[in-house]
Interface confidence: medium
């Protein structure tokens, strides 16, 4: 049977915008790395479309992605982590669009967790601590963290603090008394690796003490 009947479909497909973006996560599952790609246009018809990565792989020349609804995903130990890989959108054997990408420049860290805030009455401050799985990793160890906090009533008025450690002190006098605050944290690779902000950690909520009228300080 002739394959010509499908050629019109391919020609139509070439008119579509197959722009895509990807991010990598290193040692996301033990020693396994992951790579996630998605089309930038959410309306792209992804039927019969596949993603393939070639080059800068250990032991194999190419790997195919698995499709999970509208995203394409690989989990493997086979990323070399040096040099550029060629990532292509394919229909059958035909490549529709390709990008050369160094996986170390599109790293998205895992979200921080265990965020908590402890009020120190004697010091009149709040100690913010959180954890990150990257402390135990071989590759993406060095991160910059972005701690964002706001008064719960100020919907878009976030204050951001960048830090490289997992501990931050907020001075009581810089916060409104008797107010409910929301705080969250995210991370981005620093040093050798480059990439994107992680997802935000789950938010933590804390209340500041009221002002003690006699001393002018918060309770």
């Amino acid at each position: 049977e002739s394959g010509y009947a499908q050629n019109g479909d391919l020609e139509d497909a070439e008119l579509d915008d197959y722009s895509f973006s990807c991010y990598s996560q290193l040692e996301v599952n033990g020693s396994q790395h992951s790579l996630t790609c998605a089309f930038e246009d959410p309306d792209v018809n992804t039927t019969n479309l596949e993603f393939e990565i070639c080059g800068a792989l250990v032991e194999v020349k190419c790997l195919n992605f698995r499709k999970l609804q509208e995203i394409y995903f690989i989990e493997t130990k086979k990323f070399l982590l040096i040099g550029k890989s060629n990532i292509c959108v394919k229909v059958g054997e035909k490549s529709l669009t390709c990008k050369k990408i160094d996986l170390t420049t599109i790293v998205k860290p895992e979200a921080p967790f265990d965020l908590s805030v402890i009020y120190r009455e004697g010091a009149n401050d709040f100690v913010v601590t959180f954890n990150t799985s990257h402390l135990q990793k071989k590759y993406v160890k060095v991160l910059m963290h972005d701690v964002a906090y706001r008064q719960e009533k100020d919907e878009n008025k976030w204050t951001h603090v960048n830090l490289s450690s997992t501990k931050l002190t907020l001075l009581q006098r810089k916060l409104q008394p008797a107010a409910m605050y929301e705080i969250k944290v995210r991370s981005i690779p620093d040093h050798y690796f480059k990439g994107f902000w992680s997802e935000w950690s789950p938010s933590y909520y804390f209340r500041t003490p009221e002002i003690n009228n006699s001393s002018g300080e918060m309770d």
């Epitope: 080059g55 032991e59 020349k61 040099g83 071989k138 050798y192």
Partner: antibody, heavy 121, light 109 residues
Amino acid sequence: EVQLVESGGGLVQPGRSLRLSCAASGFTFDDHAMHWVRQAPGKGLEWVSGISWNSRGIGYADSVKGRFTIFRDNAKNSLYLQMNSLRAEDTALYYCAKDEYSRGYYVLDVWGQGTTVTVSS
Amino acid sequence: AIQLTQSPSSLSASVGDRVTITCRASQGASSALAWYQQKPGKAPKLLIYDASSLESGVPSRFSGSGSGTDFTLTISSLQPEDFATYYCQQFNSYPLWITFGQGTRLEIK
């Protein structure tokens, strides 16, 4: 034709400096990591230093760490090795080599013909 | 760092012989191993990568095998142009380094 041409070698006194250059042609230079490998007279191959395509990944052999600096200029398709505090044991033929990670992992698939460095008083 | 030990350091053989050179790594490194041939006064030439993949243009009498810590280069029927020094090589990607075996010199008997 893929080609690497080294230059900058010569006779130098111990403690002095020298800069080696490697001119690349025939391939997309900024897609590839590059390396310097040396071979002392009558001896085997010794990897000296390597640099990733974007200069963020750099490595050195312990024997040259702190004395040699590798760098590249992708706009000029050139690789360099700045050699300071040279010692007699640095005397060797220095090769520039291109890596070909698409083969599956680091392999040096193209080599220059080398430039000779002699360190002697 | 991983150390590579080649054996033998040198060997004599005749045209038509089958020759085997081994390379042992001080720690396991999957199949990430390459073999090079170097003739006097010439730059090294890539023969085998990924332990067993033949580089384009290299005669099929050359073959590689092995994984983990033990690797082998075999020349099934020696030709006059095969007399040279052979090196194995491994790498690490982070931090970046490459290491070579000490070489095996193959001479005419």
